[in-house]
């Protein structure tokens, strides 16, 4: 019991580092006056419970009264929060919470209330986020078996307990632990901000959390937003225990890659109908997004600062903005936002000074797509602004000319006509095709290089769509290009995959099929409804990784690019997905921006649908995180099963 081996003190006694059967262990030595009942209580709990999230008992002694338990090499969570918060990456924060929730649901399934969940009682074994065992719950001193009715004694630690526990003389149950878990999650998210203050003002510490008056974690502690975790904290900290999720539900919520990777969710003002968006240049001062919106008779340009979530909007045109492009001129050190409108106007505004604005030569029909390409990544060579129109024309402007009022295009290519609009332009993510652009015009896919002559023109009308043959003649709405061409057609629930060399259809990605797999399990929708909600609205390619598909029913499908197998369906993400794009945004580095609509019925007799646009920012690693988390859970399941079997034996 030399002081150098002391790991910690408590009212019960002390914990020492020791060796037992050749292993480093933690030995809990109880005070001389400790009743045998307390030791027995902890022993009863420890002997019957075997789980990867609970500290394992290795041996026990009566003289002196002691418990020999496994040693957590990285110490307690509160030590980490106070001394090494830099180690707490987002993934690690998530895994710690997940492991604690796993332990809690296991205890609760055994009808045990833990009653003292706090960072000090969470022990860490590693800080490697994909390790099978990272965090475990320790110190069962006051854990108690409870009958269905619950228990009454007031226990727990001030500042970390549920209001019903703090009040005393009130029956409480496992839901009290869920409240404490909400506080633990809050402390993980804010890296222990309130604990530091709690040491200064201990009386207020308990008071604030009991009254549910904890300050907003993002505004008060400046931590990065984490929408689904913030929502979970609020649910766990409900005053009424019945309104809190169960520990099993908490675990299920945490067991989701979406929770980890959804980094921002911003609701835009009601009835702002966003048609298009473009992200600021990654070198720019702040992470921000330009949005094109409006109604038929007016075009609104909006600016969203992602750091402050400040949203401003201005009416800039007399007709709806259908597409946007950002033209960055490195030599002039300035950027211009180009808006293409329904009336064919190309409005150009300096991103830093709204007084500097003008129009380019008017197009002959609605501007349906804009693309600022960089055939060369070197600033010495020319870059171009490409403009597609509803009457099938492609206008090419040299990027520098956007500064000039009334500037005319270098060249106009007639690719389609009034019934075959040029709806999309795309650059290949395939490095072997650096100088090739692709587009969709009517039912044709075309390609061209920096001399602006059409190289390929592929007719995509085909009889190979089988039950989706009706969509073969529909106009292409979006094309993305990798080793193959992925195209979506108007109202079609299918993504067609075309081979660039053979110019033949080489695959179909049937969104209805994938949605049905998910929905049949949950008995969600009829086939007709599914076909409607599965219609593809937008595609986005994540280089060498995944194809993101946004549907009209508000679902996001992630497919593995190499196998075209489904990685994940993010079901009912919104009512309708509108725009998806990858972006590099300052500190947010490599994100996927997804813009969707939600329709809400307004109050009153006239059941008008109110539309609210919602912008979400996703960590680009979502496809990897889905797979990592699945593997992680699988390994832990096997471990839990092994421990269960061992305990039975």
């Amino acid at each position: 019991q030399a002081p150098e081996f002391l790991l910690g003190d408590g009212s019960f006694g002390s914990v020492y580092r020791a060796a037992y059967e050749g292993e480093e262990v933690a030995v809990k030595i109880f005070n001389k006056h400790t009743s045998l009942r307390l030791l027995r209580q902890e022993l009863v709990v420890l002997c019957h419970l075997h789980h990867p999230s609970l500290i394992s008992l290795l041996a026990a002694g009566i003289r002196p009264r002691m418990l020999v338990m496994e040693l957590a090499s990285k110490g307690s969570l509160d030590r980490l929060l106070q001394q090494d918060k830099a180690s707490l990456t987002r993934t690690l924060q998530h895994r710690i919470a997940l492991h604690v929730a796993d332990g809690l649901r296991y205890l609760h399934s055994a009808m045990i209330i833990y009653r003292d969940l706090k960072p000090h009682n969470v022990l860490l074994f590693t800080l490697y986020p994909n390790a099978a065992i990272i965090a475990k719950i320790a110190d069962y001193g006051i854990a108690q078996y409870c009958c269905r009715m619950g228990i009454k004694t007031s226990e727990g630690t001030p500042g970390f307990r549920a209001p019903e526990v703090a009040r005393g003389n009130v029956i409480y149950n496992q839901q009290a632990d869920v409240y404490s878990f909400g506080l633990l999650l809050y402390d993980i998210l804010t890296t222990g901000g309130r604990i530091v203050e709690g040491l200064k003002f201990p009386n207020e510490f308990d008071e604030l959390e009991i009254q549910g008056k904890l300050p907003d974690p993002v505004k008060e502690y400046g931590c990065a937003p984490w929408p689904m975790v913030e929502k979970l904290i609020k649910q766990c900290l409900k005053e009424n225990p019945q309104e809190r999720p169960t520990s099993a539900q908490v675990f299920d919520i945490l067991n989701s890659a979406e929770l980890v990777c959804l980094t921002r969710r911003i609701l835009l003002p009601k009835n702002v109908i966003v048609e298009c968006m473009v992200a600021t240049h990654h070198n720019s001062r702040n992470a921000s997004i330009w949005l094109g919106c409006g109604h038929t008779d007016r075009g609104q340009l909006s600016f969203l600062d992602l750091n402050t979530e400040g949203y401003t909007s201005e009416e800039v045109a007399d007709s709806r903005i259908l597409c946007l492009a950002l033209v960055h001129l490195p030599v002039e050190k300035e950027s211009w936002i180009v808006s293409g409108t329904q009336s064919g106007t190309l409005l150009v505004i300096n991103t830093e000074d709204g007084k500097k604005r003008h129009t380019l030569e008017k197009m002959t029909d609605s501007v349906t797509c804009l693309y600022c390409n960089s055939f060369s990544k070197q600033s010495k060579q020319k870059n171009f602004l490409l403009v597609g129109t509803a009457d099938g024309k492609l206008a090419i402007f040299e990027d520098k000319t956007v500064k000039l009022k009334g500037a005319a295009p270098l060249k106009i290519l007639n690719i389609g006509n009034v019934s075959t609009p040029l709806m999309c332009l795309s650059e290949s993510t395939n490095s072997t095709e650096r100088n090739v652009m692709w587009g969709g015009c009517g039912t044709k896919i075309f390609s061209f290089s920096n001399d602006f002559t059409i190289q390929k023109l592929i007719e995509t009308r085909t009889s190979q769509l089988f039950s989706y043959a009706a969509f073969s003649d529909s106009n292409i709405i979006t094309v993305v290009v990798d080793t193959a061409l992925y195209i979506a057609k108007q109202n079609s629930p299918v993504v067609e995959v075309w081979d660039k060399k053979t110019e033949k259809l080489c695959g179909l990605i049937d969104c209805v099929h994938f949605l049905r797999e998910v929905m049949v399990k949950e008995n969600k929708e009829s086939k007709h409804k599914m076909s409607y909600s599965g219609r593809v609205k937008t595609l986005c390619l994540q280089k060498n990784t995944a194809l993101w598909i946004g549907t009209g029913g508000g679902h996001i499908l992630l497919l593995d690019l190499s196998t075209r197998r489904l990685i994940r369906v993010i079901y009912n993400f919104c009512n309708s997905v509108r725009v998806m794009m990858t972006a590099q945004l300052g500190s947010l580095k490599n994100v996927m921006l997804v813009l969707g609509y939600n329709r809400k019925n307004t109050e009153g007799t006239q059941k008008q649908k109110e539309i609210q646009s919602c912008l979400t920012v996703w960590d680009i690693n979502l496809p990897h995180e889905v797979q990592n988390l699945e593997k992680h859970i699988e390994v832990r399941k096997e471990l839990a099963e092994k421990m269960r079997r061992t305990s039975v034996e």
Epitope: L301, S302, F303, T312, S313, E314, E315, I349, E352, D353, G354, K355, K356, R357
Partner: nanobody, 115 residues
Framework: QVQLVESGGGLVQAGGSLRLSCAAS????????MDWYRQAPGKQRELVAT???????DYADFVKGRFSISRDNAKTTVYLQMNSLKPEDTAVYYC?????????WGQGTQVTVSS
Amino acid sequence: QVQLVESGGGLVQAGGSLRLSCAASGIIFHWYDMDWYRQAPGKQRELVATITTGGRADYADFVKGRFSISRDNAKTTVYLQMNSLKPEDTAVYYCSFQDHVLRRWGQGTQVTVSS
């Protein structure tokens, strides 16, 4: 649709302080330099202070060292902190900016400094 709404005016004793606010809507706020003007009874409107899009401030000589202009792009608001007020500062204070076509004005807020 473009709106500038001033607030914070009132009656104050000489030597006192006031903070005026101007909330802007219907514009992409960070695009524009913002100005405070004032108009005393029977006098012409005069420029008091300007803040550029980058946050640089400029003041009329008669308020230098006493007044301070600032902006909060997230809140789309421009402020005028007025200290050591004098009776001659009594006026209607207007928030304003120049867009690509014309100069826009708020409705003004009355500041009265009693001696």
